[in-house]
């Protein structure tokens, strides 16, 4: 079945082109040889001009970008929303963990509260900063918490007869905290639990944010001129022959898209691996690898660590009395 | 053992949590996210097919356009002729991905490496050292409220792990996504949708 003869007046082509580019007189009145065309190479007279061809190419690339954006819309929404929800949820967990820990101090060790609240607050601020990607070392965070707590525990609970603490004794007590391992293995235990759970949490959030970046990159891809020419030939060149209602062949479309998307499709292998690796990570996020579990239980572990200090109070007070005698003498003067 | 900080439950939001019908933990939300993401596992390989199915393509017509002429839909010419004497499609593929795509591939490689190193091997969730330090003491089943604490006498059950997500101000169901709906379909490796794209012929 031969193709229908082209529109003798180019009227149909004109009215369609008018929708793309209102008011421009680029469409020939009647079919022309079209020897200047570079994409829609004519087999006979054509209703297209070089200017029209350029406009078609622009429109084709724009259409392609819109199609790509609509393709990724649901996926993009899924990751963006979840990244936001998890970030907020993690902040809520941190806030509750802080409140739990403060409540533990208030209910069990009221004499420590003003200073303990400050140290606990700083510790959980660091936890938040770490989750959001700051370069803090978890061991340093935990050490700092116990370094700060011990002088207060010693001067308020174990040796309350001391005069108002001055820097000297506090500094000696900070040193003694590590040298004498006054909290036993609790700091180490907390370091292990907190670092494992926070590392996993942080990488989980990082992965979600990278997912957003991947989709955004795909979303805003600019297609090459070659691709623009292929798309124009597929979607618009038929109009030049007055074939307004005809559609591209399916197989042809697939070949063109494979060509245009050759680069993008290369992401596929790594994208699959990304989802499967994320799944593996999520499957392992429980017990000490689950920050919700670990942080909400910190108040209990910190409580146990203070009980450990109290249990060894007598022995510690004697040792510290000798170790920090110099600082104490200076204080009494 | 530690005084359980009940007095914290004055937060109205948390009071609300206790009465949530469909309770969710962070871990259930994570698993739900993974299931949804897995339906997009073929997203990139399915893109060319997706775009063809969402731009005008001859489906029921006998004749279709192959880039040069009108041909019968099932003829050899339907896919081939439009490419002849135009420009080399192979050349286009040989150029390789543009820098921005290469960059994103590098970032994916990096995060995949990180994710793999961070993934917990099955059955090794508890380190030996932690086990010895009493992390596992106390009798807590996996399906019950998780046990939290480090030593026997300090063990506390945190009631149902707070169900934090009920507290969040917005709901996250993708069904409520703005715009048109679209679903990844794993079975046929194709993404289907109901968008209309502007400016299409």
């Amino acid at each position: 079945q031969p193709p229908p003869p082209p529109d003798a007046t180019c009227h149909q082509v004109r009215s369609f082109f008018q929708r793309l580019q209102p008011g421009l007189k680029w469409v020939p009145e009647t079919p022309v040889p079209g020897s200047d065309l570079q994409v829609c190479l004519p087999k006979g007279p054509t209703c297209c001009s070089r200017k029209m061809e350029e406009k078609y190419q622009l429109t084709a690339r724009l259409n392609m970008e819109q199609l790509l954006q609509s393709a990724s819309m649901e996926l993009k929404f899924l990751i963006i929303q979840n990244a936001a929800v998890f970030q907020e949820a993690f902040e809520i967990v941190v806030r509750h963990a802080k409140n739990y820990t403060n409540a533990m101090f208030k209910n069990n060790y009221p004499s420590l509260t003003p200073q303990a609240f400050e140290f606990v607050g700083e510790f959980f601020t660091d936890v938040s900063l770490y989750i959001l990607g700051s370069d803090i070392n978890v061991d340093d965070m935990v050490n700092e918490l116990f370094d700060s707590l011990f002088p207060v525990i010693y001067t308020q609970m174990m040796n309350p007869g001391l005069p108002e603490s001055v820097l000297d004794i506090n500094e000696c007590l900070r040193g003694a905290r590590r040298d004498l391992k006054v909290f036993g293995s609790f700091p180490k235990l907390i370091m292990t639990q907190v670092s494992k759970s926070l590392q996993v949490t942080r990488i989980f959030l990082q992965a979600l944010n990278l997912g957003i970046e991947v989709i955004n990159t795909t979303d805003h891809l600019k297609f090459s001129k070659d691709c623009g020419r292929m798309l124009t030939r597929m979607w618009y060149c038929s109009y030049c022959q007055g074939l307004m209602m005809v559609k591209p062949c399916g197989g042809y479309c697939n070949v063109v898209m494979q060509g245009c998307m050759a680069g993008v499709v290369e992401i596929d292998k790594y994208w699959r691996e990304y989802i499967l690796s994320l799944e593996e990570l999520v499957n392992g996020m429980y017990r000490i690898y689950d920050m919700e579990n670990v942080l909400l239980g910190l108040f209990s572990t910190i409580h146990d660590s203070i009980q450990y200090v109290q249990k060894n109070g007598g022995k510690l007070t004697t040792t510290i009395g000798k170790l920090c005698a110099h600082s104490q003498q200076r204080q009494y003067r | 053992s530690a005084y359980y900080p009940e007095d914290l439950f004055i937060d109205k939001k948390i009071l609300k949590v206790a009465h949530v019908e469909h309770e969710e933990t962070l871990s259930s939300r994570r698993r739900e996210l993974i299931q949804k993401l897995k339906s997009f596992i073929n997203f990139y390989s399915a893109l060319p097919g997706y775009i063809c199915s969402h731009s005008p393509v001859a489906e029921n017509d006998t004749l279709c356009w192959n880039g040069q002429e009108l041909v019968e839909r099932y003829s050899q010419k339907a896919a081939r002729n439009g490419m002849k004497n135009q420009f080399n499609l192979h050349e286009l593929k040989m150029k390789g991905p543009e820098p921005v795509v290469s960059q994103i591939i590098d970032k994916l490689k990096h995060i995949n490496q990180l994710l793999r190193t961070m993934s917990v091997p099955k059955g090794k969730v508890l380190d030996k050292s932690l086990d010895e330090e009493g992390l596992e003491s106390g009798d807590c089943g996996d399906d019950e409220d998780e046990c939290i604490g480090s030593s026997g006498d300090g063990m506390v059950k945190v009631k149902n792990q707070l169900r934090f997500l009920a507290e969040l101000a917005y709901d996250l169901d993708v069904d409520d996504a703005p715009g048109n709906k679209q679903h990844g379909n794993q079975k046929d490796n194709e993404i289907t949708t109901s968008h209309s794209v502007g400016n299409m012929p």
Epitope: S128, S134, I136, D139, D140, E171, C172, R174, G175, R178 | -
Partner: antibody, heavy 121, light 111 residues
């Protein structure tokens, strides 16, 4: 008495290297983050670098990244700043400062008296 | 990393009050990060006046107070005294935990 004493400053030609030291006393050095801050003649304070209590985390200003290296020896209670590829704009009084926190930068609550570094040909 | 913004100078008569502002961004003064204030006399090392937005170290007179709101912080000196004439610097840290100082404000006590 809490004290910080810088040393190692002096006149140096552009492109050359210099190593500053800061001896700490009167406090538990290994418990605190430490900093180097500089002040060019007649100018404001410019933070240079910091290191966490354990030395595991280090931080640098953009202007010195890749040229300067901060380190500490907790057994000797000493902080160091290795300055390579020095430029005229590195001329300043370099202060060593102790942070009130251990894990990262917060507030600098003890300062040394400073050591002058002059980079000139 | 860019410096925090402070006015170059401020002045007041003895007994009056002076407030110095310090403006940053959501990644330094805003967010989780704390603001500190320092006093520096010519040829001397700086001295910490305020930490954690509003806390005074021991030995700092209560005439000095600090506050923070959003991405701005301020230092207030009430009952200005002659010895308060000095340079004042605000300081915070950014999301990469790098320290950032303000450009400094010269406070002059008049009369």
């Amino acid at each position: 008495q809490v004290q910080l004493q810088e040393s190692g400053g002096g006149l140096v030609q552009p492109g050359r290297s210099l190593r500053l030291s800061c001896a700490a006393s009167g406090f538990t050095f290994s418990s605190y983050a430490m900093h180097w801050v500089r002040q060019a003649p007649g100018k404001g304070l410019e933070w240079v670098s910091a290191i966490s209590s354990s030395g595991r985390s280090t931080y640098y200003a953009d202007s010195v990244e890749g040229r300067f290296t901060i380190s500490r020896d907790n057994s000797k209670n000493t902080l160091y700043l290795q300055m390579n590829s020095l430029r005229a704009e590195d001329t300043a009084v370099y202060y060593c400062a102790k942070d009130r926190r251990g894990s990262h930068a917060d507030a600098l609550n003890v300062w040394g008296q400073g050591t002058l570094v002059t980079v000139s040909s | 990393q860019s410096a925090l913004t402070q006015p170059p100078s401020a002045s007041g008569s003895p007994g009056q009050s002076v407030t110095i502002s310090c403006t940053g961004t959501s990644s330094d003064v805003g967010g989780y990060n704390y603001v500190s204030w320092y006093q520096q006399y010519p040829g001397k090392a700086p001295k910490l006046l305020i930490y954690g937005n509003s806390n005074r170290p021991s030995g700092v007179p209560d005439r000095f107070s600090g506050s923070k709101s959003g991405t701005s912080a301020s230092l207030a000196i009430t009952g200005l005294q002659a010895e308060d004439g000095a340079d004042y610097y605000c300081q915070s840290y950014d999301s990469s935990l790098r320290v950032v100082f303000g450009g400094g404000t010269k406070v002059t006590v008049l009369g």
